[in-house]
Amino acid sequence: LTCLGGFASPGPVPPSTALRELIEELVNITQNQKAPLCNGSMVWSINLTAGMYCAALESLINVSGCSAIEKTQRMLSGFCPHKVSAGQFSSLHVRDTKIEVAQFVKDLLLHLKKLFREGQFN
């Protein structure tokens, strides 16, 4: 998350390229849904706090055979400092709550947009 560190500087602050690309990919996914995303697969909900990139990847990596989120999985791995494999869980998962992948992606997108919005005002 160090790429967010520069947002407090004065003047125009372009979003980090990686974060911009992740947000744009999540936008593509949410707006291009013609059928239930990943056949309506359910994933563990996560706490959208520090470490959320790894937690998000740990949730989504358990969805297999869904080409729509493969690019997102690759992008998230670039934000997560450690290797993530299927079946791995962190304390950031809300283990008693499963939601559809489509809702998970939209929640993550909203949080990332808000992160950037709030960062640019500080």
Partner: antibody
Framework: QVQLVESGGGLVQPGGSLRLSCAAS????????INWVRQAPGKGLEWVSG????????LYADSVKGRFTISRDNSKNTLYLQMNSLRAEDTAVYYC???????????????WGQGTLVTVSS | SYELTQPPSVSVAPGQTARISCSGD??????VSWYQQKPGQAPVLVIY???DRPSGIPERFSGSNSGNTATLTISGTQAEDEADYYC??????????FGGGTKLTVL
């Protein structure tokens, strides 16, 4: 507090030109998408054009493409709309409206100016 | 191009709950904003990101969005809530899109 003040409206003949301005204050102008939205008398809202925080991207509704040009001067905290080849159907109140943030997906307006009336008539 | 459809008018008794719908293809995959506009005035944002309220907007305003329909709910509607309401969203192709507007009448 956020303030957007439009000017430059008036009566113009069909085929004529007009340049609208929007003076912004109360926020970091160079960190937001800004839009022009219009409202014909007794009608609904119609998005006209938008410009990225750093002028790197300009977007137009099909109805004005090729006739209107949006621009901004971040050193003056001012937004512009150059309107050429005006038609009767361009008659409307033109609002300057700030976007939610700097991302393309954050173009949706939050704060609006009071508007300036453009009347195209012979 | 992307289109949003709203009912032209909705009526509600004071103190009752008003619901204004906004329908569009997979609107649940976008983030919806709602604007209130009173005669002769500029629009005012009352809901953004589906269900967030800007500061200064009363708690009686709330929003929801899923599937093909977004809804603005006004609980305990007051006379001052009488206005035109517009839904809006951002779409990758059309950019900013607004619904046709709904006139809310408080009986």
């Amino acid at each position: 507090q956020v303030q957007l003040v439009e000017s430059g409206g008036g009566l113009v003949q069909p085929g004529g030109s007009l340049r609208l301005s929007c003076a912004a204050s109360g926020f970091t102008f160079n960190s937001y998408w800004i839009n022009w939205v219009r409202q014909a008398p007794g009608k609904g809202l119609e998005w006209v054009s938008g410009i990225a925080y750093d002028s790197s991207n300009t977007l137009y509704a099909d109805s004005v493409k090729g006739r209107f040009t949006i621009s901004r001067d971040n050193s003056k905290n001012t937004l512009y709309l150059q309107m050429n080849s005006l038609r009767a159907e361009d008659t409307a109140v033109y609002y300057c409206a700030r976007g939610l943030g700097a991302f393309h997906a954050d173009m949706q307006p939050d704060y609006w100016g009071q508007g300036t009336l453009v009347t195209v008539s012979s | 191009s992307y289109e949003l459809t709203q009912p032209p008018s909705v009526s509600v008794a004071p103190g009752q709950t008003a619901r204004i719908s906004c329908s569009g293809d997979n609107i649940g995959g976008t983030f919806v904003s709602w604007y209130q506009q009173k005669p002769g005035q500029a629009p005012v944002l009352v809901i953004y990101d589906d269900n967030d309220r800007p500061s200064g907007i009363p708690e009686r305003f709330s929003g929801s969005n899923s599937g093909n329909t977004a809804t603005l709910t006004i609980s305990g509607t007051q006379a001052e809530d009488e206005a035109d309401y517009y839904c809006g969203t951002w779409d990758m192709v059309t950019n900013n899109v607004f619904g046709g507007g709904t006139k809310l009448t408080v009986l």
